[in-house]
């Protein structure tokens, strides 16, 4: 199995009441604008075939995609939460910059690509859905990386 290195985040990142609350508020605000409740981006299908030790690396990929392809382009929306949450998530991304896995990560890239394809296929509503799932992104990073 591939070996994960530097795929760790300190628990304190997920224990800051103010920014945690803002992240969940942003997710709630966006989910109110999401009318496609049958589609779930972050869930069982994303983790399918990925071992526990690989999940932080998987979530790093999802976090980077969410920042670059969703949050930055949508940064003028859902204020004031967006302007506080984006820098927080960017810091987490930066702390995971040295997170890699040794060996084949094709199965992980395949799962991440399905998520990306779903977001792209849904267009702007896919981006809104991704923002609405920031609570799930937060939980997944916490569960996988601490």
């Amino acid at each position: 199995a591939p070996i994960s290195s530097h795929c760790r985040l300190d628990k304190s990142n997920f224990q800051q009441p103010y920014i945690t609350n803002r992240t969940f508020m942003l997710a709630k605000e966006a989910s109110l604008a999401d009318n496609n409740t049958d589609v779930r981006l972050i869930g069982e299908k994303l983790f399918h075939g990925v071992s526990m030790s690989e999940r932080c690396y998987l979530m790093k990929q999802v976090l980077n995609f969410t920042l670059e392809e969703v949050l930055f382009p949508q940064s003028d929306r859902f204020q004031p939460y967006m302007q506080e949450v984006v820098p927080f998530l960017a810091r987490l991304s930066n702390r995971l910059s040295t997170c890699h896995i040794e060996g084949d990560d094709l199965h992980i890239q395949r799962n991440v690509q399905k998520l990306k394809d779903t977001v792209k296929k849904l267009g702007e509503s896919g981006e809104i859905k991704a923002i609405g799932e920031l609570d799930l992104l937060f939980m997944s990073l916490r569960n996988a990386c601490i």
């Epitope: 989910s31 299908k45 939980m139």
Partner: antibody, heavy 119, light 107 residues
């Protein structure tokens, strides 16, 4: 419309097994999972476990580990819950509920199946 | 495992009353909490998910609040149809846990 329809009431003897079915309709079965919840007479709700209709992966409550088996048949959009070595305190209404498993609520429930364990 | 504690276990109220039921988690669960209503002989019905989001078809007089360990379900003006038992539930990672229930009775 979206619904879950469970099999009929069962009467079983102590030590026997019961298998309850839950047929889903009105939604893409493999996009969700199924949780099983039971309720003894006059008591509260007790979560028993969850099965993915996508992969068949299961997660059972510790209390039922080794005694319960949850399965799905995607060709008929049906979930099954088998409980073995029945005791009188297993007498309860057994509900299936739609649940994606990963931080999800139970938005659709079956009507319930009464299982009576009596000698 | 996370334990959910509901209070009160029984509550007597009158039509038109504002009613509050509380639920406490044994550890922080962020906003991963749902509320259900159950009437005798019927399956539970989802009212609130993610602590404060109103489920489809649930009347707007129901509202939820809370974050972390302490949560509340509020009925703004009690209607005859609201006399039932209410359960909170922790929405977990492939796991769930219910509170013991609150029976809402007519005063």
């Amino acid at each position: 419309q979206v619904q879950l329809v469970e099999s009929g009431a069962e009467v079983k003897k102590p030590g026997a097994s019961v298998k309850v079915s839950c047929k889903a309709s009105g939604y893409t079965f493999t996009s969700y999972g199924i949780s099983w919840v039971r309720q003894a007479p006059g008591q509260g709700l007790e979560w028993m476990g969850w099965i993915s209709a996508y992969t068949g992966n299961t997660n059972y409550a510790q209390k039922f580990q080794g005694r319960v088996t949850m399965t799905t048949d995607t060709s008929t959009s049906t979930a099954y819950m088998e409980l073995r070595s029945l005791r009188s305190d297993d007498t309860a209404v057994y509900y299936c509920a739609r649940d994606r498993g990963y931080y999800d609520a139970f938005d659709i429930w079956g009507q319930g199946t009464l299982v009576t364990v009596s000698s | 495992d996370i334990q959910m504690t509901q209070s009160p276990s029984t509550l007597s109220a009158s039509i038109g009353d504002r009613v509050t039921i509380t639920c406490r988690a044994s550890e922080g669960i962020y906003h991963w909490l749902a509320w259900y209503q159950q009437k005798p002989g019927k399956a539970p019905k989802l009212l609130i998910y993610k602590a404060s989001s109103l489920a489809s078809g649930a009347p707007s007089r129901f509202s939820g609040s809370g974050f972390g360990t302490d949560f509340t379900l509020t009925i703004s003006s009690l209607q005859p149809d609201d006399f039932a038992t209410y359960y909170c539930q922790q929405m977990g990672e492939w796991k769930a846990a219910f509170g013991g229930g609150t029976k809402l009775e007519i005063k």
